[in-house]
């Protein structure tokens, strides 16, 4: 029975050339988190494994940093980084929980953070 919910940083924006922290939090379940995947579309950015720690995909090593916590830091942002990002929590015994974050990378110096929201 999957009872958990994922809270994410929601719709966020950041300046071109800057950095942003993507964060998700799983609550309302006692399931054990075995691994968290960070994905952009169908591309794997990074993995945080309970056993083995962090693994950053080779193609993103220069611009992705692990943390804080189970979150992910994107650096040297470009307009091409605009889009959907997903945190996938692999848990036992519940299974898979997915959270969505939409990032907009702005040319201007004004980047406002969106509201937090929940995905059941």
């Amino acid at each position: 029975m999957m009872t958990g919910t994922i809270e994410t940083t929601g719709n966020i924006s950041a300046e071109k050339g800057g950095s942003i922290i993507l964060q998700c939090h799983l609550s309302s379940t006692t399931a054990q988190v075995t691994q968290v995947n960070w994905e952009q579309q169908d591309q794997l950015l990074a993995i945080c494994n309970a056993d083995l720690g962090w693994h950053i995909s080779p193609s993103f090593k220069d611009r992705v940093a692990p943390g804080p916590g189970l979150g992910l830091t994107l650096q040297s942002l470009t307009v091409n980084d605009t889009g959907e990002y997903f945190c996938i929590y692999h848990t036992y015994p519940d299974g898979t929980y997915t959270g969505r974050i939409f990032l907009e990378v702005l040319e201007s110096s004004v980047a406002e953070h969106g509201a937090r929201f929940q995905i059941p």
């Epitope: 494994n49 309970a50 083995l52 692999h90 015994p93």
Partner: antibody, heavy 119, light 107 residues
Framework: EVQLVESGGGLVKPGGSLKLSCAAS????????MSWVRQSPEKRLEWVAE????????YHPDTVTGRFTISRDNAKNTLYLEMSSLRSEDTAMYYC????????????WGQGTSVTVSS | DVQITQSPSYLAASPGETITINCRAS??????LAWYQEKPGKTNKLLIY???TLQSGIPSRFSGSGSGTDFTLTISSLEPEDFAMYYC?????????FGGGTKLEIK
């Protein structure tokens, strides 16, 4: 080339025990979670155990909990399945399989080892 | 547990044809369904995972679609080596469960 080679199967009486092994090669064994899956004589597939890459976390379905134990020796690149209190319904071909690094599905399987539980 | 119903259990087709195999889950499994090919004397091969993602090295004539409870494996322009047993498996929640299999034979 990724290779998984199972061994240790055989004929065992009901209530008996058996320990299966799976020798892995061609990849960094400790980086991957591993599973055991069995296939009944009727060709039904059933997941029976999983272990995390470092061996800290193990998972079993209710059908085998308390009877089957999965373990691994990363120094020897070997996966194990210790089976006790065996029943006739445990008769199957047992496969070890590697989980994808992203935890989606099992990307490599062994050729299997046969276990027959019969008096 | 999530029950997976796979259909048909048997399918006869000719090389060059396009076929579809279906799997239905007893409840939503999001996109998390995998497809495997089983052939005598060979190890099981992962074809598709997460519903539609093609495993590296698998020919593009294999494709997967669906989400929620209904999923389809399509093999277009069947090649002689495609005649085999096919299984689906949900990887959304424990315990992982499989469909009953589809035997694809040459007509």
């Amino acid at each position: 080339e990724v290779q998984l080679v199972e061994s240790g199967g055989g004929l065992v009486k009901p209530g008996g025990s058996l320990k299966l092994s799976c020798a892995a090669s061609g990849f960094t064994f400790s980086n991957y979670a591993m599973s055991w899956v069995r296939q009944s004589p009727e060709k039904r597939l059933e997941w029976v155990a999983e272990i995390s890459g470092g061996g800290s976390y193990t998972y079993h379905p209710d059908t085998v909990t308390g009877r089957f134990t999965i373990s691994r020796d990363n120094a020897k690149n070997t996966l194990y399945l210790e089976m006790s209190s065996l029943r006739s319904e445990d008769t199957a071909m047992y496969y070890c399989a590697r989980k994808r690094r992203d935890y989606y599905a099992m990307d490599y399987w062994g050729q299997g080892t046969s276990v027959t539980v019969s008096s | 547990d999530v029950q997976i119903t796979q259909s048909p259990s048997y399918l006869a087709a000719s090389p060059g044809e396009t076929i579809t195999i279906n799997c239905r889950a007893s409840k939503s499994i999001s996109k998390y369904l995998a497809w495997y090919q089983e052939k005598p004397g060979k190890t099981n091969k992962l074809l598709i995972y997460s519903g539609s993602t093609l495993q590296s090295g698998i020919p593009s004539r294999f494709s997967g679609s669906g989400s929620g409870t209904d999923f389809t494996l399509t093999i277009s322009s069947l090649e002689p080596e495609d005649f085999a047993m096919y299984y689906c498996q949900q990887h959304n929640e424990y315990p992982w469960t499989f469909g009953g299999g589809t035997k694809l034979e040459i007509k």
